[in-house]
Structure formats: C-alpha cells, structure tokens
C-alpha cells in the first residue's frame, strides 16, 4: 500500500510545485520525493524497505497521477542510496537519494528545489508547506491529484513530551503540528517547504495521523548537508 497521506489539506495548484516527485513501485505511487538536483530526487529510506524485487521509478512534472499531462515523465532509477545509518526500526536518518537514469528535462513544471544548508532550527510557529499524493481521509480515499497543507512548525521540546513523541525527536529531526491537518505514512519522502526552501522530508515511521498529540516528524535536510553533497558529487 502507498506510504502516506495528506489529511485536512486541499488540492494543490497544478504544477506550482515543480520539485514534487512521486516515487513509484511497479507503476503505483509509493512515496513522495523532491527533486534536489537535475538527476537526483530526495525521499525517505523506509520507502524502499519492501521494494526488494519491484521496479522503482520516479514521476516528475505531474499533478494528476492518472491523466496525461505534457510535463509528466517517468524516469527509471539508476541508483538508490539510502542513508548508511538508516534502520528499519527507527525514524532516524530516514533519507534516500535516487539517481535518475538521466538528467531530468527541466521546465516550468520540473525544477529542483533549493534545500537548506544552514543547520539552524526553523522557528516554532513558522508555516511550512507539505504536499503529497497520500490518502486524504481516514477512510483511505486516495487522491489522483497532488494535495497540500500548510502546517506550523512545533518546537522540539513540546514534540519530545511523553504524550507526544517522548524523547524520540533528535536535533536532526523537526516536528510540525498535526491537529486534523497532517502528513502521514503515505506522504513519506515528500518535502516540507518553509519560505521556498526545503527544510524537511516526511519520515516514514508509522504513527497516528491528524492527532494533535502526535505531531508530524520530518528529517531536517540541513543536518545531512555533508552526506547529500557527498552523494551528489
């Protein structure tokens, strides 16, 4: 099943997020992703855990998953590079870099997103945008078109409270509020964008969605700048 959902959001403006990628397994949407360089998409390591024998591809330039669109193109994956410290049973280091079989054809609907290199926390309360093709309600309805939602960043101390994530949120992770509006498993690998810059990647650990006491968890890309640069080099 696809890993993720946007809850309480709305349909995104078509092609207004040209960095948005759909990571696909055997032709079906699996996870979100974000184009960070002409030939590289950043996603979540856990997304490929169950993809051992399947065909992984990346869809760029899409708004609708099913409808033909001039900007849409499906790319094969030349190389998948999970973060070396990612492990199945933790949310830590949940990053994956996918090298496309060729450089993406850039245009208004396909363009890399600048990512944060300065390792400093986003201020609590900052509104950030998260988008994805995950299911849109608890009944499991899957959208065909890209959804998005604006979420305020939550301070790490609150996120680390026993009734929230009880100490699991390291300096390399960040949280966003989850009161009915939320990202969830199926949006894993998708971008959290603050002020036009990629700040976080949706983690793919299992958690309740849309419950304000269980905030969304995002991997802070700035904390992994050295690793990203080393892979892209």
């Amino acid at each position: 099943p696809p890993r993720g959902r946007i809850l309480g959001g709305r349909e995104a403006e078509a092609h207004a997020r040209p960095y948005m990628a759909s990571v696909q397994l055997n032709g079906a949407h699996l996870c979100g992703g974000v184009l960070v360089a002409e030939q590289w998409v950043l996603s979540a390591a856990h997304c490929l855990e169950d993809a051992a024998d399947g065909k992984v591809q990346v869809l760029l330039g899409a708004h609708s998953l099913s409808q033909p669109e001039p900007s849409k193109r499906l790319y094969d994956v030349l190389r998948a590079v999970p973060h070396p410290d990612s492990q199945p049973d933790t949310i830590d280091h949940d990053l994956l870099l996918l090298q496309l079989s060729e450089k993406a054809t850039l245009g208004p609907a396909v363009r890399p997103l600048p990512w944060q290199r300065v390792d400093r926390d986003v201020a609590p309360g900052t509104l950030c945008d998260v988008a994805g093709w995950g299911i849109v309600n608890h009944a499991g309805r899957r959208p065909d078109s890209l959804q998005h939602v604006l979420l305020p960043v939550l301070d790490r101390a609150t996120c680390n409270r026993r009734t929230h994530h009880d100490g699991a949120i390291t300096e390399r992770l960040m949280c966003a509020e989850s009161n009915r509006r939320d990202s969830c498993k199926g949006d894993s690998g998708g971008p959290l964008v603050c002020g036009g810059v990629l700040e976080g990647v949706v983690t793919s650990g299992s958690r309740v969605c849309g419950n304000r006491k269980k905030p969304g968890i995002y991997t802070r890309v700035a904390s992994y700048a050295a690793w990203i640069d080393s892979v892209l080099a």
Epitope: P124, D155, R156, A157, T158, N160, R161, R162, T163, H165, D166, G167, A168, I169, E171, V208, N211, K213, K214
Partner: antibody, heavy 116, light 112 residues
Framework: EVQLQQSGPELVKPGASVKISCKAS????????KNWMRQRHGESLEWIGD????????AYNQKFKGKATLTVDRSSSTAYMELRSLTSEDSAVYYC?????????WGQGTLVTVSA | DVLMTQTPLSLPVSLGDQVSISCRSS???????????LEWYLQKPGQSPNLLIY???NRFSGVPDRFSGSGSGTDFTLKISRVEAEDLGVYYC?????????FGGGTKLEIK
C-alpha cells in the same frame, strides 16, 4: 552523557525565599521540558510543575501555585525554581527531571531545610 | 487529581523470589491520544528515582528483563521475576496522562 547537576543544600529561615538551580549537560537544553518534583522525608514524590525551555511557558500543580516559580537561562543551560514564603512544611528534597523519554534523567536532588 | 494507590506498602522478600506490586488509579489513565502513560520508578536509599517501565509495559533501556509491567484502564502491576539485592528500594507508580501528573505512595521492597 546526560547530566542534571543541582545546586547544594539550603538552610533557610521561615518566611524567606530560596532559588535552586539545575544545570543540564550532555544534550541540547532547549529540546526537552524540565519538570520539578518535591519529596518530603519518608514520603512519596509530588509534581510541582514544568517549563518549556524555548518559550519559558510554565504549568504548575495547583497546590504549588504562588509557592514555586520556574524559570530558565538558555545561555547557561540552567533551569531554576524559586520557592517563597517558606515554612517548615516546605522542608524537602527537590528534584529536577528531564521529560523525554518519560522522566529518564533526574538531578541528584537539593535538600531544602526550613528552620528558625 | 488522579489518586494512585499502591499495594502493599511494604514487601519483605527473599532473594530469588518472584514479587508483584499493584497500582490502582482513581480514574482511567488512558490519554486522549489513546496511549496509557503509566510508569514505574525505583528509588534506592539516598538516590534519585530511576525509570524502569514506561507506557505500562515497555522496559527502559538497560533495565533487566526480570522486570515486567502489565495492566490497563485503572489496574496495573509491576512484576519482578527473581529479586536481586540491587532491586531493593522503594517502587513508585506514576501517571502522566492527566494534569497534574501523580505518583503512587510507594512500595518498599526489603529483605525479610
């Protein structure tokens, strides 16, 4: 290694105030709430209140409102608790504890003795 | 406030014994998020409390597997399968689901 180092024992007179400290090391101070507990001699623990080190927001047990005031100094990674209008009933060991995971990390305790 | 009642108050044991400590809350301590924040702490003489069990049955890292927690709703139990000398002290249950968080009165585990 996570450590919470509390200030030393205090002997204070009735009616006076005392401010005890809890210095954190081995982790990022602003990433976890700080909680305070009281334990009178031979008794159980009572939760006094907590503080968010980012915002300074506090929550208190109704029982300790007006008695305890919690503050933090982020520059020195230190949490403080001031106790005022002390009586013999306030003689106890006071603990700070980091919240997350649970109360896994505690200070060593500060003994406050109120005596004329 | 949620009252946490522990029994027994004192528990004389021999080393190697299996023992159980009971904790009852005056109301359900299931949090609105669905989790139950029931914890167990051990306080040895002259020391700060140590976390043993969180969320009813999860052992904190480094806690020996002879400690186990169980229960739901309002009734909870801590079991020690084979008591060792280092286990002696006062055991406290704690609920963190409701404000203010509250501790039980304590159970003193001592040698017979």
């Amino acid at each position: 290694e996570v450590q919470l180092q509390q200030s030393g024992p205090e002997l204070v007179k009735p009616g006076a105030s005392v401010k005890i400290s809890c210095k954190a090391s081995g982790y990022t101070f602003t990433s976890y709430y700080k909680n305070w507990m009281r334990q009178r001699h031979g008794e159980s623990l009572e939760w006094i209140g907590d503080i968010n080190p980012n915002s300074g927001d506090t929550a208190y047990n109704q029982k300790f409102k007006g008695k305890a005031t919690l503050t933090v100094d982020r520059s020195s990674s230190t949490a403080y608790m001031e106790l005022r209008s002390l009586t013999s009933e306030d003689s106890a060991v006071y603990y700070c504890a980091r919240e997350g995971p649970s109360f896994a990390y505690w200070g060593q305790g500060t003994l406050v003795t109120v005596s004329a | 406030d949620v009252l946490m009642t522990q029994t027994p108050l004192s528990l004389p044991v021999s080393l190697g014994d299996q023992v159980s400590i009971s904790c009852r809350s005056s109301q359900t301590i299931v949090h609105s998020n669905g989790d139950t924040y029931l914890e167990w702490y051990l306080q040895k003489p002259g020391q700060s409390p140590n976390l043993l069990i969180y969320k009813v049955s999860n052992r904190f890292s480094g806690v020996p597997d002879r400690f186990s927690g169980s229960g739901s709703g309002t009734d909870f139990t801590l079991k020690i399968s084979r008591v060792e000398a280092e286990d002696l002290g006062v055991y406290y249950c704690f609920q963190g689901s409701h404000v203010p968080p509250t501790f039980g009165g304590g159970t003193k585990l001592e040698i017979k």
